[in-house]
Amino acid sequence: SERCDDWGLDTMRQIQVFEDEPARIKCPLFEHFLKFNYSTAHSAGLTLIWYWTRQDRDLEEPINFRLPENRISKEKDVLWFRPTLLNDTGNYTCMLRNTTYCSKVAFPLEVVQKDSCFNSPMKLPVHKLYIEYGIQRITCPNVDGYFPSSVKPTITWYMGCYKIQNFNNVIPEGMNLSFLIALISNNGNYTCVVTYPENGRTFHLTRTLTVKVVGSPKNAVPPVIHSPNDHVVYEKEPGEELLIPCTVYFSFLMDSRNEVWWTIDGKKPDDITIDVTINESISHSRTEDETRTQILSIKKVTSEDLKRSYVCHARSAKGEVAKAAKVKQKVPAPRYTVELACGFGAT
């Protein structure tokens, strides 16, 4: 009845688990909201209480910890399902309290079905491998804490639907999967199935991740400006539309921010009075190298605009480059009746 610090529904932690598999879910309070851990809270006499709201219901209800074979149990700050059922889907709340203190947070738990090829609505983590690197490994994720170190599970790896056996450059090594000299054909979904015994029962953990082979840092170069270049001159008459594309190639670099921008007479377009618009498009190669194009457009260019300096700039973690566009005013073709006649001495 007393006030409780309610952190609301933590949708950032959209937890998805597979049906008919064990799941261990830590109370998010200690990981993301409170400055102390469960042991400290427990020592201080605080109690952790769990309850839930079923999918499409409003009613909060206690979790039944008296199910056959302890299907749902709590251990310290962890809620255990051994295993999950489809109708365990809902919003779960963990509340830490005593007579003077109360804090709680809710989080959504979705129990997901998978088919025989491990396809499911599960959001998959992406692991990037560098093309042509010698040896790179992925590790079966999120299996810590399910079984003690004395238990030796069996691990089977799959690519898509196929068990990985005698794959030329993909080698299962227990919890790890090694890739030798990765190629783009190694792109795909990889699944590890971990099987372990517990109290006379056998449990399976299924973990799928997406492997994406990307450009290698050894091949990375500073940004390359393909346009503007020295071969193209933007020759316009006043009143015409001026369109200058700035096209830049960026090597893939992990966590690099790629930037392209124009300056006009050394200033950003926003900082000058002329009516200029800039449209950007981005495309990616199969190894996630990036090509950015920014088209600078002046609808009705003036003779003053044609005297300005238009410079395309690009920056990545590999360096910064710039290139000026060649812009000039078109010399109008002579009108015979006036210019040429005058030239011939006509009056």
Epitope: E132, Y133, I135, N168, I181, L183, I184, S185, K218
Partner: antibody, heavy 118, light 107 residues
Framework: EVQLLESGGGLVQPGGSLRLSCAAS????????MTWVRQAPGKGLEWVSA????????LYADSVKGRFTISRDNSKNTLYLQMNSLRAEDTAVYYC???????????WGQGTLVTVSS | EIVMTQSPATLSVSPGERATLSCRAS??????LAWYQQKPGQAPRLLIY???TRATGIPARFSGSGSGTEFTLTISSLQSEDFAVYYC?????????FGQGTKVEIK
Amino acid sequence: EVQLLESGGGLVQPGGSLRLSCAASGFTFSQFGMTWVRQAPGKGLEWVSAISYDGEGTLYADSVKGRFTISRDNSKNTLYLQMNSLRAEDTAVYYCARFRYYTAFDYWGQGTLVTVSS
Amino acid sequence: EIVMTQSPATLSVSPGERATLSCRASQSVSSNLAWYQQKPGQAPRLLIYGASTRATGIPARFSGSGSGTEFTLTISSLQSEDFAVYYCQQYNNWPWTFGQGTKVEIK
């Protein structure tokens, strides 16, 4: 100019061993994967083995797995192929080649002949 | 292992004529296909990579096309130095595999 020069070929008895070398010049050797390809007399090309630029990743054709070992010394710009338990069917010209995923085997050596015969 | 099949095994062509060589992969190799030329007693030379991109220094009369499983090498007007054996190779999946070769001979 990119150059690859193989050496170490010769006549060897079945069950014997041979070590081929490939000396590279004209490019940054440590930046490229390298490979061995062989060609039996009057036959087509067969990929034998590949090694990553850093020497950590190695791959082999099934026909040589467990018998051949590819290695490299980036400080010496040299690629090696250690061939053990040689068989008559390993008789071939052995070429080393530079590879990149984007451009396949873009430069080749002139080859060295290995003859396995009693 | 991806099997590469070239046809025909031998192609007899007169100098100045067009030659069309085919290569088929047992499964898709995307556009990760190369063509090599080999003359007697010499090492192979890269002609085409990425199914259609000419390697450095290769004359424009050589062109490649195709993607997936069907590929073609075309020599628009055969010169005397073009009579050789041509191999296709996939580098999409390990092991990288070659076709058995097409011999282009003088008719």
